[in-house]
């Protein structure tokens, strides 16, 4: 039968190539059975994950899963890095895998690399 533990569906070693200046929503898909857990986002700094206190977040509910969303409006160059969501459930802390944002700081739309170029060039960081 289905587990009633909270599960956080962020893929291990997942990456997103995004453009500075664009809006972006980072989703933490959350599966739970009864009461929705308290979920937070943090940003990795070395081995510690620093809680993101003053950032805009929201919930999106779907039939079988909920999404805790971290909003970037807009994406800034220093948003580059790895993020993790965590859920508090019955006094347990459940942590997701980390997901990495690669932010490309492009000056004009004409200079923007294609999605395929960005996917294969994660060294284009600022």
């Amino acid at each position: 039968k289905e587990s009633c533990d909270v599960q956080l569906y962020i893929k291990r070693q997942s990456e997103h190539s995004i453009l500075a200046g664009d809006p972006f929503e980072l989703e933490c898909p959350v599966k739970y059975c009864a009461n929705r857990p308290h979920v937070t986002w943090c940003k990795l700094n070395g081995t510690t994950c620093v809680k993101l206190e003053d950032r805009q977040t929201s919930w999106k509910e779907e039939k079988n899963i909920s999404f805790f969303i971290l909003h970037f409006e807009p994406v800034l160059p220093n948003d580059n890095g790895s993020y993790r969501c965590s859920a508090n459930f019955q006094s347990n802390l459940i942590e997701s895998h980390s997901t990495t944002l690669y932010v490309t700081d492009v000056k004009s739309a004409s200079e923007r690399p294609s999605k395929d170029e960005m996917a294969s060039r994660p060294w284009l960081l600022y």
Epitope: Y9, K11, Q13, E15, S17
Partner: antibody, heavy 119, light 112 residues
Framework: EVQLVQSGAEVKKPGESLKISCKTS????????IHWVRQMPGKGLEWIGR????????KYSPSFQGQVTISADKSISTAYLQLSSLKASDTAMYYC????????????WGQGTLVTVSS | DVVMTQSPLSLPVTLGQPASISCRSS???????????LNWLQQRPGQSPRRLIY???KRDSGVPDRFSGSGSGTDFTLKISRVEAEDVGVYYC?????????FGQGTKLEIK
Amino acid sequence: EVQLVQSGAEVKKPGESLKISCKTSGFNIKDTYIHWVRQMPGKGLEWIGRNDPANGNTKYSPSFQGQVTISADKSISTAYLQLSSLKASDTAMYYCASYEGYYERFGYWGQGTLVTVSS
Amino acid sequence: DVVMTQSPLSLPVTLGQPASISCRSSQSLLDRDGKTYLNWLQQRPGQSPRRLIYLVSKRDSGVPDRFSGSGSGTDFTLKISRVEAEDVGVYYCWQDTHFPYTFGQGTKLEIK
């Protein structure tokens, strides 16, 4: 039933290009990473790269970077491996594999596509 | 790149006897999430590979319990408690902790 069905065997000439497909069913392709692996005749397995069908992000082995393009169309649950400027040394069996991305709970392999490059 | 070294490369075994394959990695496969991403694959003659073991010791569904995986860090072992005829083929270890992911050279298991 879980299936990864790859396109059929191909015979190509040097310099030509080729796109192999891997049609998945029985699971949600967005929950997985699709890997591509090469096996040259009588040899071992070599990791080419992987694609995240959920967002299109792709990672390549440096040994294959620039020689291949990996992609996926999540709307039809199909992954692709494109080989360009084929050489005789590209003759090999190419496998797709689908691994669950969250907890590694499954890892399925396609039946392989034999590519022969010969003038 | 992480180099995966298997031994032996050839393993003749008598039916019903145990078999053991070693896999060593050139660096630790322990990921920052505390898990170790080491898989064992079986490739029977003329077939595509099949995952037997993941996360060092977890058996895939449908894999007989005579197969077991163990190890940590850089040193891993696949054991078959009693070899059967259907176990003939090549066994590969595969790490997916560090990019690029890498395979061992393969160990060919044959019946004596």
